[in-house]
Interface confidence: medium
């Protein structure tokens, strides 16, 4: 069954989850008693076309409601779990009262007031962020939307819209809240290897362990297919078949200028003479291409103590 929720003493209007594009009449029942819900508007809870209206809602209205669409050859039944909550005492809106999160980016963005199209509402819609009324000119309420100019991370938070539903000469309040998060516009660039340097030679001691880091940056945010890896003599380390040489999987890092970078470390447990004749390639690749920095190992010259 689908779920809907509302707040005590506010209007709540829900639709039959089975309705699709059906034009056939819809009947509503209290699921537990099978008692039919009337269509007369003088009742606090009544049916109007495919909609069930709670004007206003009470906590005791919570429960499962059944709707039946009667067509000549088939009856379709839908179930709706309705929960009416007491108004939260503080400004912290619990998760169960939140509608889907809106993700914003770029210069302008809009937040839509959830469920508003079910109601007979009139402009303007009032908007609040973390319970404070929005009065800056950057925030513009238009129809069922809130437009935010020059969005920044500071605009993240819980946005509540409040509007009035008019029925039979009476006005009812409706409020709905959703979170707004700002996604930073990322950029992708051709990989840049920051370590090791191009055509680098590294000094090692025979019999001692050695480790070489391959680090590369790929831009900021939204990277696809970004990888750093080592190859030995043009063969990936896992296939090289030398247990002494292992690759430690890429770590995510952030560089000083806030770019997204990856590091993979090549570890040799005990360097042998044979290792000095191998070619070690640090590879960085993403969607756009690949760059290779080749390094060689050289025996460390003993320090002359004469």
């Amino acid at each position: 069954s689908k779920s809907s929720w509302g707040l005590e003493n506010e209007a709540l209007i829900v639709r039959c989850p089975q309705r699709g594009r059906s034009t056939y009449p819809v009947e509503w029942y209290y699921s537990d008693t099978n008692e039919s819900i009337p269509t007369q508007k003088r009742n606090r809870i009544f049916v109007s076309r495919d909609r069930l209206k709670f004007l206003p809602a009470r906590v005791e209205d919570s429960g499962i409601y059944a709707c039946v669409i009667r067509s000549p050859n088939l009856n379709k039944t839908g179930y709706l779990n309705v929960t009416i909550h007491k108004k939260p005492p503080s400004c912290n809106i619990p998760d169960y009262l939140m509608y889907s999160t809106v993700r914003g980016s770029d210069k302008n963005f809009k937040i839509t007031c959830p469920t508003i199209d079910l109601y007979n509402w009139t402009a303007p819609v009032q908007w609040f962020k973390n319970c404070k009324a929005l009065q800056e000119p950057r925030f513009r309420a238009h129809r069922s939307y809130l437009f935010i100019d020059n969005v920044t991370h500071d605009d993240e938070g819980d946005y509540t819209c409040q509007f009035t539903h008019a029925e039979n000469g009476t006005n009812y309040i409706v409020t709905a809240t959703r979170s707004f998060t700002v996604e930073e516009k990322g950029f992708s660039m051709f990989p840049v290897i920051t370590n090791p340097p191009y055509n680098h030679t590294m000094e090692v001691e025979i019999g001692k362990p050695a480790s070489i880091a391959c680090s590369a940056c790929f831009g900021k945010g939204s990277h696809f297919l970004a990888d750093v890896l080592w190859q030995i003599n043009k063969t990936v380390v896992g296939n090289f078949g030398e247990a002494r040489i292992q690759e430690e999987e890429g770590r995510n890092e952030s560089s000083s200028n806030d770019m997204d970078c990856l590091t993979s470390v090549l570890r040799i447990t005990g360097v042998t003479e044979k290792d000095l004749s191998l070619e070690y390639d640090c590879l960085a690749l993403n969607l756009h291409g690949m760059i290779r920095h080749t390094i060689r190992l050289r025996r460390k010259q003993p320090i002359d103590h004469r």
Partner: antibody, heavy 128, light 113 residues
Framework: QVQLVQSGAEVKKPGSSVKVSCKAS????????MHWVRQAPGQGLEWVGV????????TYAQTFQGRVTITADESTSTAYMELSSLRSEDTAVYYC?????????????????????WGQGTTVTVSS | DIVMTQSPDSLAVSLGERATINCKSS????????????LAWYQQKPGQPPKLLIY???TRESGVPDRFSGSGSGTDFTLTISSLQAEDVAVYYC?????????FGQGTKVEIK
Amino acid sequence: QVQLVQSGAEVKKPGSSVKVSCKASGYTFTDYQMHWVRQAPGQGLEWVGVINPGGGSTTYAQTFQGRVTITADESTSTAYMELSSLRSEDTAVYYCARGGVEYSSSWDYYYYYGMDVWGQGTTVTVSS
Amino acid sequence: DIVMTQSPDSLAVSLGERATINCKSSQSVLYRSNNKNYLAWYQQKPGQPPKLLIYWASTRESGVPDRFSGSGSGTDFTLTISSLQAEDVAVYYCQQYYSIPVTFGQGTKVEIK
């Protein structure tokens, strides 16, 4: 010569999974991206996803996110594309295609472009 | 997603005549890091996989006849067949490789008039 050979046609029931293989030969498997593209009957080309066989990283089209898994077995130079929770609209020819690479010697850059070698295609039919 | 739009949907050209197919991307596919347009053209004949003709918008793939040429930059691209041959009857697709998801145009069917 460079070749991609795909597994044979499959007939599947809705809700089941299919795993298509693509065996590469004639080049170093780990040096090139491998894409998967599908084509429904009488329709255009739709990109499914891509893998870097060397590093193992993958990226999928949003449409298939959560239903598709692309893997690569370096030891056999074979790429795989597995699609789960099949529905009738997944009926299509599935192609593997190698990502082209242009080498620039000045900086050891390898620029990726298009899809230069394609498999023969695997027909997947989803029908109850 | 970058949307690729080809025009026309189909094209009938006499043998030996020029055929021109246009492709427009919803945003630029020119990658500033290497000043290359990440755009490719493919030819697909019935019952066959697509075949790469052009990459970087204007570089001909090896083995492709020189009657095929690509041009354009940024968002507007053109594939030209300078002198249509019988074997060129196919569907042609443009494709951007600039960002994920990789996207193709809807295809242009080239026939002989």
